[in-house]
């Protein structure tokens, strides 16, 4: 479970077609 103080930070993961991009790479979203 994520710590409460972390909740407003973006979480970054590897994914494909994410973050408005066509290729695979890191994507950080709140």
């Amino acid at each position: 479970r994520r710590r409460r103080r972390d909740t407003h930070f973006p979480i970054c993961i590897f994914c494909c077609g994410c973050c408005h991009r066509s290729k695979c790479g890191m994507c950080c979203k709140t």
């Epitope: 994520r2 710590r3 103080r5 972390d6 930070f9 973006p10 979480i11 970054c12 993961i13 590897f14 494909c16 973050c19 991009r21 290729k23 695979c24 790479g25 890191m26 994507c27 950080c28 979203k29």
Partner: antibody, heavy 121, light 106 residues
Framework: QVQLVESGGGVVQPGRSLRLSCAAS????????MHWVRQAPGKGLEWVAV????????YYADSVKGRFTISRDNSKNTLYLQMNSLRAEDTAVYYC??????????????WGQGTMVTVSS | YELTQPPSVSVSPGQTATITCSGD??????ASWYQQRPGQSPVLVIY???KRPSGIPERFSGSNSGNTATLTISGTQAMDEADYFC??????????FGGGTKLTVL
């Protein structure tokens, strides 16, 4: 100016521990993901670990998982690498590197000067 | 997974140097390139396949498709002599670097 300065390297015996530090200046440290990358003498680059914005959002290379711990103290603008159960193959220059700004931080845009870690009996 | 680079590339001053990086489905990932001069730390020269960070000369360019990413240095200068490393993400826990290519400017 933007700067990363590593410290804490040295000679250590196999099985022992060492903690590296990376002091950041010239940018808003808390707004960037931070990496550790190492380079064995005369060899190529090897990614070690990354810590993103949240303390819980961190990843490790298989070669160090369970032995190394990456952490950050945003109040001190400092990145850390706690290295336990060190092996001879961990001998390398250890660089801290800043992840690119933005929602898609694929590259390492700022690098420190590196600190040498030698694991030897 | 692994990224494969030629160990060395030689070029005459003013000519074009081409450094390749090969890996499984590399063209489906974003490739970055780093320059490392002897005794110095790496410097980012290309990211997201084709983009140049501010301060990097226009003679550096990149491409990436299929299984191969390419770094091209046009009008190569003596100061470009260095090791060059490609890099790409294959998962959240697998960031790969190529073995490096030593560029010699003859």
């Amino acid at each position: 100016q933007v700067q990363l300065v590593e410290s804490g390297g040295g000679v250590v015996q196999p099985g022992r521990s060492l903690r590296l530090s990376c002091a950041a200046s010239g940018f808003t440290f808390s707004s960037y993901g931070m990496h550790w990358v190492r380079q064995a003498p005369g060899k190529g680059l090897e990614w070690v670990a990354v810590i993103w914005y949240a303390e819980s959002n961190k990843y490790y290379a298989d070669s160090v998982k369970g032995r190394f711990t990456i952490s950050r103290d945003n109040s001190k603008n400092t990145l850390y690498l706690q290295m336990n159960s060190l092996r001879a193959e961990d001998t390398a220059v250890y660089y801290c590197a800043r992840a690119q700004e933005g929602i898609a931080p694929d590259a390492f845009d700022i690098w420190g000067q590196g600190t040498m870690v030698t694991v030897s009996s | 997974y692994e990224l494969t680079q030629p160990p060395s590339v030689s070029v005459s001053p003013g000519q074009t140097a081409t450094i390749t990086c090969s890996g499984d489905k590399l063209g489906e990932r974003y490739a970055s390139w780093y320059q490392q001069r002897p005794g110095q730390s790496p410097v980012l020269v290309i990211y997201q396949d084709i983009k140049r960070p501010s301060g990097i000369p226009e003679r550096f360019s990149g491409s990436n498709s299929g299984n191969t990413a390419t770094l091209t240095i046009s009008g190569t200068q003596a100061m470009d002599e260095a090791d060059y490393f490609c890099q790409a993400w294959y998962s959240s826990t697998n960031v790969l670097f190529g073995g490096g290519t030593k560029l010699t400017v003859l």
